[in-house]
């Protein structure tokens, strides 16, 4: 056959769906690879062809669209499963072609099983809620396009294994779940199950997401440098190791990039000739506030090094701060031992 633009296996789109549930999968060509949509392609006389390679096989085969009750069907650029079976797992290819043009892409589809508490190998989206921030909502995700607006589905919400009912601060409201005032105790996995009828059959859509309660923007402050500070002086003799920790607290801020860096005499350590190493560690609080520690280390400090200016800098979306470390050369102690010994009449 003639050449076809092959976009390969699009592993960025690792599609996971639950067994025995409907799944609608759009051909990725029109979403990520081509500059025109399905309608334009169809109008131009291009045909969309689907085929698949089942798990642990190399053989590409056409998709059987003649299964009982149209279990697998195609509608425009969407491949439908009503519902999925475990052995539908495999790599699916959609190919757009006519006599002069051809483009195709493959993507993996994994049909997964859930347990009685909705646990599964499914990768879960994370939804962040601000702590004690007033009413916030999460919405049952990825259910658009499964049923017409004339159909009124029923939605049941679960936290872990349990139906959400009579919770103090969590209220199911159809497709939405409202958190009246989010608390750390609201952290966990939330599942919505959407039940709807279609052609005399009942279908279910299960969607699980992880809720993480994070620091509120109301409480957010610019970075706080705990160390270095005015109370600690780093006094060293030449030849000793100099270790200065820079410890910075960052309030949680959505999509903020937290940065910590050292300057030595106003320059980045990489830009100067002395042998400096910097090790960083990061820890998080329960509300995802962040503490970053960068330890500046000079193995064998010289008297020149002890005259330099060591400044810790920190930046977040809330602002930038800096703090200089107090570094000085240790003055050799007077050798009192001999005089004291003589005073006590020692021989």
């Amino acid at each position: 056959s003639e050449r076809c633009d092959d976009w390969g296996l699009d592993t960025m789109r690792q599609i996971q769906v639950f067994e025995d549930e409907p799944a609608r999968i759009k051909c990725p060509l029109f979403e990520h690879f081509l500059k025109f949509n399905y309608s334009t392609a169809h109008s131009a006389g291009l045909t969309l062809i689907w085929y698949w390679t089942r798990q642990d096989r190399d053989l590409e085969e056409p998709i059987n669209f003649r299964l009982p009750e149209n279990r697998i069907s195609k509608e425009k650029d969407v491949l439908w499963f009503r519902p999925t079976l475990l052995n539908d797992t495999g790599n699916y290819t959609c190919m757009l072609r006519n006599t002069t043009y051809c483009s195709k892409v493959a993507f993996p589809l994994e049909v997964v099983q859930k347990d009685s508490c909705f646990n599964s190998p499914m990768k879960l989206p994370v939804h962040k809620l601000y702590i004690e921030y007033g009413i916030q909502r999460i919405t049952c995700p990825n259910v658009d396009g499964y049923f017409p607006s004339s159909v009124k589905p029923t939605i049941t919400w679960y936290m872990g294994c349990y139906k959400i009912q009579n919770f103090n601060n969590v209220i199911p409201e159809g497709m939405n779940l409202s958190f009246l005032i989010a608390l750390i105790s609201n952290n966990g996995n939330y599942t919505c199950v959407v039940t709807y009828p279609e052609n005399g059959r009942t279908f279910h859509l299960t969607r699980t997401l992880t809720v993480k309660v994070v620091g509120s923007p109301k409480n957010a402050v610019p970075p706080v440098i705990h160390s270095p500070n005015d109370h600690v002086v780093y006094e060293k003799e030449p030849g000793e190791e100099l270790l200065i920790p820079c410890t910075v607290y960052f309030s949680f801020l959505m999509d903020s990039r937290n940065e910590v860096w050292w300057t030595i005499d106003g320059k980045k350590p990489d830009d100067i000739t002395i042998d400096v190493t910097i090790n960083e560690s990061i820890s998080h609080s329960r509300t995802e506030d962040e503490t970053r520690t960068q330890i500046l280390s000079i193995k064998k400090v010289t008297s020149e090094d002890l005259k330099r200016s060591y400044v810790c800098h920190a930046r977040s979306a809330k602002g930038e701060v800096a703090k200089a470390a107090k570094v000085k050369q240790k003055v050799p102690a007077p050798r009192y031992t001999v005089e004291l010994a003589c005073g006590f009449g020692a021989t």
């Epitope: 099983q113 049941t156 199950v193 009942t202």
Partner: antibody, heavy 117, light 107 residues
Framework: QVQLVQSGAEVKKPGSSVKVSCKAS????????MNWVRQAPGQGLEWMGR????????HYAQKFQGRVTLTADKSTSTAYMELSSLRSEDTAVYYC??????????WGQGTLVTVSS | DIQMTQSPSSLSASVGDRVTITCQAS??????LNWYQQKPGKAPKLLIH???GLHAGVPSRFSGSGSGTDFTLTISSLEPEDVATYYC?????????FGGGTKVEIK
């Protein structure tokens, strides 16, 4: 389409046990709950318990705890309900009922268990 | 356990009549209520789930309503094939419990 086919009628002696089977087809057996409900002659419905074949998780009504055992064989898509220490008041039609969530969407045809000396 | 009380226990109505069956829970059940229909000698069938959600394939003359502890099943226009016993069932808190049933007959 969903089908639940139960085993045939049983006559049992008091003190013995009965094991009723329910063979499922037309859906993913491991992804739904299988409930067991009984109905004494001329009486209402009484929920006994349920099992999730996917992981074997079970819930039992307090009344039957210790006397009923629910099991499932994934390889044959068959659920079982075993009731021990039978007494005359256990005479009833026993139903299996499949539910993706908690409602019992589809039911077996029922199995009559008669306990008589 | 949550007690479910159905009324009436039986009723007789003419074809075309509007029929109403009520179900009362001993405590709030957050709309987690199902209605089942059982014809003589047959297994029950799910009619309505979650108080008002019509199960697939069930005729639209059946509807459910209610909240809190009080729920209603309505048959807008009774048909001869609706002769059956109707049960409500709560699935708010385990163990699931059923109402005593309402037997519907044609006059």
């Amino acid at each position: 389409q969903v089908q639940l086919v139960q085993s045939g009628a049983e006559v049992k002696k008091p003190g013995s046990s009965v094991k009723v089977s329910c063979k499922a087809s037309g859906y993913a057996f491991t992804s739904s709950w299988m409930n067991w409900v009984r109905q004494a002659p001329g009486q209402g419905l009484e929920w006994m318990g349920r099992i999730y074949p996917g992981d074997g998780n079970t819930h039992y009504a307090q009344k039957f705890q210790g006397r009923v055992t629910l099991t499932a064989d994934k390889s044959t898509s068959t659920a079982y309900m075993e009731l021990s220490s039978l007494r005359s008041e256990d005479t009833a039609v026993y139903y299996c009922g499949e539910g993706y969530l908690d409602p019992m969407d589809y039911w077996g045809q029922g199995t009559l268990v008669t306990v008589s000396s | 356990d949550i007690q479910m009380t159905q009324s009436p226990s039986s009723l007789s109505a003419s074809v075309g009549d509007r029929v109403t069956i009520t179900c009362q829970a001993s405590q709030g059940i957050n709309n987690y209520l199902n209605w089942y229909q059982q014809k003589p000698g047959k297994a029950p069938k799910l009619l309505i789930h979650y108080t008002s959600g019509l199960h697939a394939g069930v005729p639209s003359r059946f509807s459910g309503s209610g909240s809190g502890t009080d729920f209603t099943l309505t048959i807008s226009s009774l048909e001869p094939e609706d002769v059956a016993t109707y049960y409500c069932q709560q699935y708010s808190i385990l163990p699931w419990t059923f109402g005593g049933g309402t037997k519907v007959e044609i006059k």
